[in-house]
Amino acid sequence: FNISGCSTKKLLWTYSTRSEEEFVLFCDLPEPQKSHFCHRNRLSPKQVPEHLPFMGSNDLSDVQWYQQPSNGDPLEDIRKSYPHIIQDKCTLHFLTPGVNNSGSYICRPKMIKSPYDVACCVKMILEVKPQTNASCEYSASHKQDLLLGSTGSISCPSLSCQSDAQSPAVTWYKNGKLLSVERSNRIVVDEVYDYHQGTYVCDYTQSDTVSSWTVRAVVQVRTIVGDTKLKPDILDPVEDTLEVELGKPLTISCKARFGFERVFNPVIKWYIKDSDLEWEVSVPEAKSIKSTLKDEIIERNIILEKVTQRDLRRKFVCFVQNSIGNTTQSVQLKEKRG
């Protein structure tokens, strides 16, 4: 299709080489009142089209995205050619940063209902640059945490070094929806609730003498509880003796609950005590069996191919640790009678 009639928007993505970062493009098809370019023939305000503009409905889930190759080749369907770019409804998600994402992206409705809809499309010229060292050292992260129940704020990474007074007007989106009343480079959250979690996008306009473009940054906001003040507790085994049958295989499970920590480095391991000797056992990897906002339950098993007489003289110890401290639970094997 002919893209010369598409409206054009220029965007800049300045990414940090230090952190993982995502980016999004919205299919900003015009609303009915702004949609004079959704028609093959541009209309003056006094002219009235015979057909309603395409975007009569707010359902933007059915759009098609293309990339325009720089060599003038035909448009490429994003979904077929770019595995690191994902389409979710009307939003295009770039999962990895890099200058190779620079280019022209076109979106238009899948359903063309009338000849007037042919040029109902948006062309986004995306320029991607790595952040220069000259940029501010303490810019806000693209991953920000909000502590549940407390106050907090969400900062626009590309503007976080500027004072509120210097900052240009910012347009914020949350999960693709416009937050029309938020206009500063920092959103103040009076009290953090779980619904504050999500993907926030901040846009502001920069211009020079020739043209203007939108500078965009994406912030992943996570709502968290405060770091635990407790060491992990062992949920299983509970008993310190276990009845076993000699010669049979045996699996002993150690399940431990770890409270939330922002920097989470849980340790769960098994070791064996035999008189004065003590050694760590090579056992299968630990696995998370339940994860909530407040805590995580991790399990690690010790597997004996067959229980021997020697095993009855040993103690099997599960050791768990977080940044606060450690807990142990030992199990003595006892032969089953009868």
Partner: antibody, heavy 118, light 111 residues
Framework: SLEESGGGLVQPEGSLTLTCTAS?????????MCWVRQAPGKGLEWIAC????????TYYASWAKYRFTISKISSTTVTLQMTSLTAADTATYFC????????????WGPGTLVTVSS | AYDMTQTPSSVSAAVGGTVTINCQAS??????LAWYQQKPGQPPKLLIY???SLASGVSSRFGGSTSGTEYTLTISDLECADAATYYC?????????????FGGGTEVVVK
């Protein structure tokens, strides 16, 4: 309960400060304390809110931003300062508190009448 | 803040009947919507919060529902005491749960 005071007759272009006093609870808990007005025979019109938690955030209707100022004076008192008043500001002014669970104004004062006239 | 458009401005129905009042938000506010009842000379009373949850002490004859940016208050089995003006209100502002803009109101007349 909530009680508004400070209403009365004021000259056009004059100023007035309304006070909302809470009893039975204090703003040491976190609430949105707000002002709403209702012109005679007309609908409800939101004016402003203040968050009584640590951020102290204030929120204004676009038309109220430059003439009206909401403030928390103490743990039981919120005020609304109004300047450059005109006849269009004649209304009953209500103080209201949001409900922490049932989001919306769960508690209202009886209202105070402000008349702007020469 | 947001613009809330309420329709109709007035509606009348017989005792035992049903009344439906609509409210349209200028942009998406999710479930952040409240409904109030106001009788002459009194402050408003909260009926519904979070678009469809009944405020404490409110009769189950009042119900709220939502579809996109359209919100509906339904009063069934109408009683004389339901004669009042009803208002919708957005209870969200940006990212904070601030009760702000009201709809224009709907007068309910019970015959």
């Amino acid at each position: 309960s909530l009680e508004e005071s400070g209403g009365g007759l004021v000259q056009p272009e004059g100023s007035l400060t309304l006070t909302c006093t809470a009893s039975g609870f204090s703003f040491n808990s976190k609430y949105y304390m707000c002002w709403v007005r209702q012109a005679p025979g007309k609908g409800l019109e939101w004016i402003a809110c203040i968050y009584t938690g640590t951020t102290g955030s204030t929120y204004y209707a676009s038309w109220a931003k430059y003439r009206f100022t909401i403030s928390k004076i103490s743990s039981t008192t919120v005020t609304l300062q109004m300047t450059s008043l005109t006849a269009a500001d004649t209304a009953t002014y209500f103080c209201a508190r949001d409900d922490r669970v049932e989001h919306g104004y769960g508690l209202w004062g009886p209202g105070t009448l402000v008349t702007v006239s020469s | 803040a947001y613009d809330m458009t309420q329709t109709p401005s007035s509606v009348s129905a017989a005792v035992g009947g049903t009344v439906t009042i609509n409210c349209q938000a200028s942009e998406s506010i999710g479930s952040w919507l409240a409904w109030y009842q106001q009788k002459p000379g009194q402050p408003p009373k909260l009926l519904i919060y979070s678009a469809s949850s009944l405020a404490s002490g409110v009769s189950s004859r009042f119900g709220g529902s939502t579809s996109g940016t359209e919100y509906t208050l339904t009063i069934s089995d109408l009683e004389c005491a339901d004669a009042a003006t009803y208002y919708c209100q957005s209870t969200f502002y940006g990212v904070n749960p601030v009760p702000t803009a009201f709809g224009g109101g709907t007068e309910v007349v019970v015959k």
